[in-house]
Interface confidence: low
């Protein structure tokens, strides 16, 4: 006869490990007992359990409550056992020794591999600002056994660098993602992807990029100067800019205080019915935590009566 087992049994931390050992014998052969032992070099052989044909399963004190026989129906030639709730310390070599009648003893070894799935963490780098050089966007660390794979999934252009630290029973892998910050990266996802044989699927942690910037400011509303005449209602100036964080707006008049009746509503400056008093230089001041910008425009309110008066004078003068 011969023993049938596996070279390697792989389980995830916390799962039950089936340690197979089946005696394929000739007709009439019987299995008297199956002794399981831990057989790591350096640790010395350590009894795990004894499966006896007459009085059943005996488990050594160190494994009490953790070793069981597979559920029925059971073949009397099957010496397999279940190791409950595998922990990393269970990883190593195991030996099953089968005593048969009349063929004698047989033994086989297998290796138990306990996968410790990683618990990944993503740490954003320092605040990103437009104009910086190559900057750390984020680092991702995962520790497990065996060493996990850490990669990045993103449409953002950047460079990655990885380093690995071996611990006594695991390995920690850290990958860093560096980029040159630009405003187009704002809101873009940067995803850390951790792969490991102990995971059913890759673990993904997503970080949304935030790049501080402030665009040049400009003022809209003066495209047609002819619209800015005395008596016109609903005239307004709008300050245009964009930034991250979103900027705040402030309006001032360079050549004096804002005229009464002029309303400031965020980026918009609203005028009451226009008078010549509204002529002047207006400044939009845009700022966020990153920077500040100014844009100024000259408003010249036309008075049709003045214009027509001048024309009459000119006519009479001729």
């Amino acid at each position: 006869g011969e023993l049938e087992t596996s070279d390697v049994v792989t389980v995830v931390l916390g799962q039950d490990a089936k340690l197979p050992c089946f005696y394929r014998g000739d007709s009439g052969e019987q299995v008297g007992q199956v002794a399981w032992a831990r057989a790591d070099a350096g640790e010395g052989a350590q009894e795990l359990a004894l499966l006896h044909s007459k009085y059943g399963l005996h488990v050594s004190p160190a494994y009490e409550g953790r070793v069981e026989q597979p559920p029925p129906p059971r073949n009397p030639l099957d010496g397999s056992v279940l190791l409950r709730n595998a922990v990393q310390a269970d990883e190593g070599e195991y030996e099953c020794r089968v005593s048969t009648f009349p063929a004698g003893s047989f033994q086989a070894r297998l290796r138990l591999r306990v996968l410790v799935p990683p618990l990944p963490s993503l740490n954003p780098g320092p605040a990103l600002e437009e104009g910086q050089g190559l900057t750390l966007a984020a680092s991702c660390t995962a520790e497990g056994s065996p060493a996990p794979s850490v990669t990045w999934d993103t449409e953002v252009k950047g460079t990655t660098s990885s380093r690995s630290f071996k611990h006594s029973r695991s390995a920690a892998v850290t990958s860093e993602f560096h980029l040159v910050p630009s405003r187009s990266m704002n809101g873009q996802p940067l995803t850390c992807v951790v792969s490991h044989p102990g995971l059913l699927q890759d673990q993904r942690i997503t970080h949304i990029l935030h790049v501080s910037f402030l665009a040049e400011a400009s003022v809209r509303g003066l495209e047609d100067q002819n619209l800015w005449h005395v008596g016109r209602e609903g005239a307004m100036l709008k300050c245009l800019s964009e930034g991250q964080p979103p900027p705040s707006y402030n309006w001032t008049r360079l050549d004096g205080p804002l005229p009464s009746g002029v309303r400031v509503d965020g980026d918009t400056l609203g005028f009451p019915p226009l008078t010549t008093e509204h002529s002047g230089i207006y400044v939009c001041h845009v700022s966020n935590e990153f920077s500040s910008r100014d844009s100024q425009v000259t408003v010249d309110v036309l008075d049709p009566q003045e214009d027509s008066g001048k024309q009459v004078d000119l006519v009479s003068a001729s």
Partner: antibody, heavy 118, light 109 residues
């Protein structure tokens, strides 16, 4: 910076239960195992068990099997250790300690004194 | 279960070298970690994985491990080193953390 802040001192009667909390901050809570260790007055350190904050799986010291329960709340980054059927010899300072895959403890809580007295 | 044995006390004069031992069956095949504990305070990791030092721990603290004995060595001992010291291992056969009984280091003078 990494901090483990434990709940305050407790006085309990024999036979009662005690539940000690340990709030973690300054690191990714689910990235590290948490252990509980106790120390009776004038005595050495005694390991009680370990919990995986990510999945909640636990391993308890054989001495405390059946009497200790370790749980966690990931929403508040807090682990709990409940010890039941208290006796006078359970009077001790109970520590939570952050571990690296069950090998060594790099950060400890300040300790919680549990006094069991009738 | 696995047992770690430490001497109850070690005395040393300031400036001298203190050696604290931790005995265990074939302890050289395990990773040993050392903690310092001052009265009324939580333990502090001073050496891990036999001989590595956490950041912030002076180079005066070192460790070794072979055969049946692990040793914590504190060179140029200072008064502030007076404390209890504990060794610790992970016993893979029982899946348990095991601490030594502790050693009280007394700095003379």
């Amino acid at each position: 910076q990494v901090q483990l802040v434990q709940s305050g001192a407790e006085v309990k009667k024999p036979g009662a239960s005690v539940k000690v909390s340990c709030k973690a901050s300054g690191y990714t809570f689910t990235g590290y195992y948490m252990h509980w260790v106790r120390q009776a007055p004038g005595q050495g350190l005694e390991w009680m068990g370990i919990i995986n904050p990510s999945g909640g799986s636990t391993t308890y010291a054989q001495k405390f099997q059946g009497r200790v329960t370790m749980t966690r709340d990931t929403s508040t980054s807090t682990v709990y250790m409940e010890l039941s059927s208290l006796r006078s010899e359970d009077t001790a300072v109970y520590y939570c300690a952050r571990g690296r895959l069950g090998t060594y403890f790099d950060y400890w809580g300040q300790g919680t004194l549990v006094t069991v007295s009738s | 279960s696995y047992v770690l044995t430490q001497p109850p006390s070690v005395s040393v004069a300031p400036g001298q070298t203190a050696r604290i031992t931790c005995g265990g069956n074939n302890i050289g095949s395990k990773s040993v970690h050392w903690y310092q504990q001052k009265p009324g305070q939580a333990p502090v990791l001073v050496v891990y994985d036999d001989s590595d030092r956490p950041s912030g721990i002076p180079e005066r603290f070192s460790g070794s491990n072979s055969g049946n004995t692990a040793t914590l060595t504190i060179s140029r001992v200072e008064a502030g080193d007076e404390a209890d010291y504990y060794c610790q291992v992970w016993d893979r056969s029982s899946d348990q953390v095991v601490f030594g009984g502790g050693t009280k280091l007394t700095v003379l003078g």
